[in-house]
Structures are given as C-alpha cells and as structure tokens.
C-alpha cells in the first residue's frame, strides 16, 4: 500500500532571465527512493539516481543544475519555460510517486512564489 505524500513548491512564478529552484519532498513512507526524475511535460530534464548521481539531459545542460538536494535549479528562464514540471520518485517497494509544479515565467518584476501544497 502506498502511504507516501509528495510536498512540492506548488504554483510558482519567476522573472524572465532569472532562476528558480524546483523542490519536492516525499514523506510518510519508509520506502527507499532509488531514483528521482524531473520532467517538463513529456521531456526528461534530469535524473538523480541513488547509486549513480545526477544526469542532466544534454539539451538542458547549460540551463539546468542539480540541487539543492533532490531539487532542480532552472537558470536563464524564458517565457517558453512556463508550464508544468513533474518530480517522479521511484521507490521500493511502494512504486512511483509523482509531484506537480506549475511555473509561470513573467516578463515583469512581479514574480511571486506560491505556497507549498501536498499531493497524495
């Protein structure tokens, strides 16, 4: 039975040209996390594997950085970066947990961070 929940940074906004940290956290389970995938819609951005460390997709190498922790830092943001981002936790024995973050990249300087929320 899957008992865990994923807490994320929720709906967030950031300025064009700036950077943002996407963060998820899996709680309420004793399952071992073996890998975390970060995806934007259907594109794989990065993988953090418990044994092998980080792999950043070549097409994002210049704009994506690992961390802090299991989070992901997006740099040099453009309006095209607006959209849904997913953290996919592969765990044993529970299986897969997915968290969703919506990022809006704004032209102006009125970017605000949303509150955290939980996805069961």
């Amino acid at each position: 039975m899957m008992t865990g929940t994923i807490e994320t940074t929720g709906n967030i906004s950031a300025e064009k040209g700036g950077s943002i940290i996407l963060q998820c956290h899996l709680s309420s389970t004793t399952a071992q996390v073996t890998q975390v995938n970060w995806e934007q819609q259907d594109q794989l951005l990065a993988i953090c594997n418990a044994d092998l460390g980080w792999h950043i997709s070549p097409s994002f190498k210049d704009r994506v950085a690992p961390g802090p922790g299991l989070g992901l830092t997006l740099q040099s943001l453009t309006v095209n970066d607006t959209g849904e981002y997913f953290c996919i936790y592969h765990t044993y024995p529970d299986g897969t947990y997915t968290g969703r973050i919506f990022l809006e990249v704004l032209e102006s300087s009125v970017a605000e961070h949303g509150a955290r929320f939980q996805i069961p």
Epitope: S27, W54, I56, T73
Partner: antibody, heavy 117, light 106 residues
Amino acid sequence: QAYLQQSGAELVRSGASVKMSCKASGYTFTSYNLHWVKQTPGQGLKWIGYIYPGNGYTNYNQKFKGKATLTADTSSSTAYMQINSLTSEDSAVYFCAREGGWAMDYWGQGTSVTVSS
Amino acid sequence: QIVLTQSPAIMSASPGEKVTMTCSATSSVSSMHWYQQKSGTSPKRWIYDTSKLASGVPGRFSGSGSGTSYSLTISSMEAEDAATYYCQQWSSNPSTFGAGTKLELK
C-alpha cells in the same frame, strides 16, 4: 569506493589568498555536487557553497559570496576553493564533500588554514 | 536563513542507556540530515532524509521528526557512539547546520 583527497595545511599571511584542492576518485566526478564546509572550534560547521562539475554551476551561501570562489577541473577530477582577503576569521578547517541528492555522503580529510598577522 | 538549535549541547550516557538528542528549526523544514564526527576526523553521513540510516550505521540509531522538531535516538548506548552529532537542513537556501550535540560516555 568514492574518495576525496584534500591538499595540505596552509599557513598564510593576513590579506593574502589561498587556493586549496579536493581530488575525487572512485566515482564519476561530473555526476555529483561538490560542497565546501568550514569548521571552526567556536562556530561549528558552516556551508560555503557547492559546484556541479557537470556544467560548472555554483551555488554560494550569500555570507561567502566574494570571499570564496569555487571551480572544478573535470580533466583531473579536482575541485578548488580560493579564499581571498584572508583575516583571522578565516582560520579554520575546510572540508570538501560529495552530494548526490541524499546528503553529503563522502568527505575529504580537511585542509587546515591558519592566518597569521 | 533557518537556524537549527541542538539540545543538549553536551550530554553523557552510560552503556546500555537510551539517548535522545533534538534539533529545532526556526522555520518548518521538510527533512533533516544528521552527521557524526569524532575528534580529529571528518564528519560522516549518519542519518539522512530524517530517518534513513546511512550505510554501516548500527540499527540502534534512529531518526524522526517533522516541521520544526527533529530528533536522533540511540536505543542502547555503546562506547563507539561517543561523538559529536550535527543536524543539517536544506529545505531552504542556504543550507545550515546545528551547533552540534557532544555525546560522551559516562
């Protein structure tokens, strides 16, 4: 088995700068963040920042921005930290540590820096 | 930045005794890491992600907590457990460490 070998102790003059190294072996250097941590007897552990050798990205603790500079040479799997404008406050042991998402799992043996006036 | 307060600063325990030390954060954090350091050596990852034991750590150690309150517990103290234990958070930049709890053998 991952291993981090740090450079030897340094005795440096106040106002000068120092550059220490951290040579990584036993793992893929470009797949892990490399952190630097300062330890002083009275102040405990202070996180300085990290570098991701895969693309050179750095993330600094604001308190050390301008004081420390982190670099990495992927050809030799070596990370470096330079500390400038040294004062007695910079006398400490500096550790490098590997981190791949699940806390800092391997640490170097530390480099002792003593600043003399 | 988030400040982590560890208590007690120093404690002593007899072999076989249960030991609990705490780490309190000024703001809520999603998880906590713990490191063990013995005099003259580098810190070692001990407990990560609040409750997961690092490789080689004896099963008598456990970690728990949520929000602003976390703890490390040793079910039965052994001589080799005498060391300083540091908590660390990275829910918020910059990462911060507690000042440490020094555990001595009575």
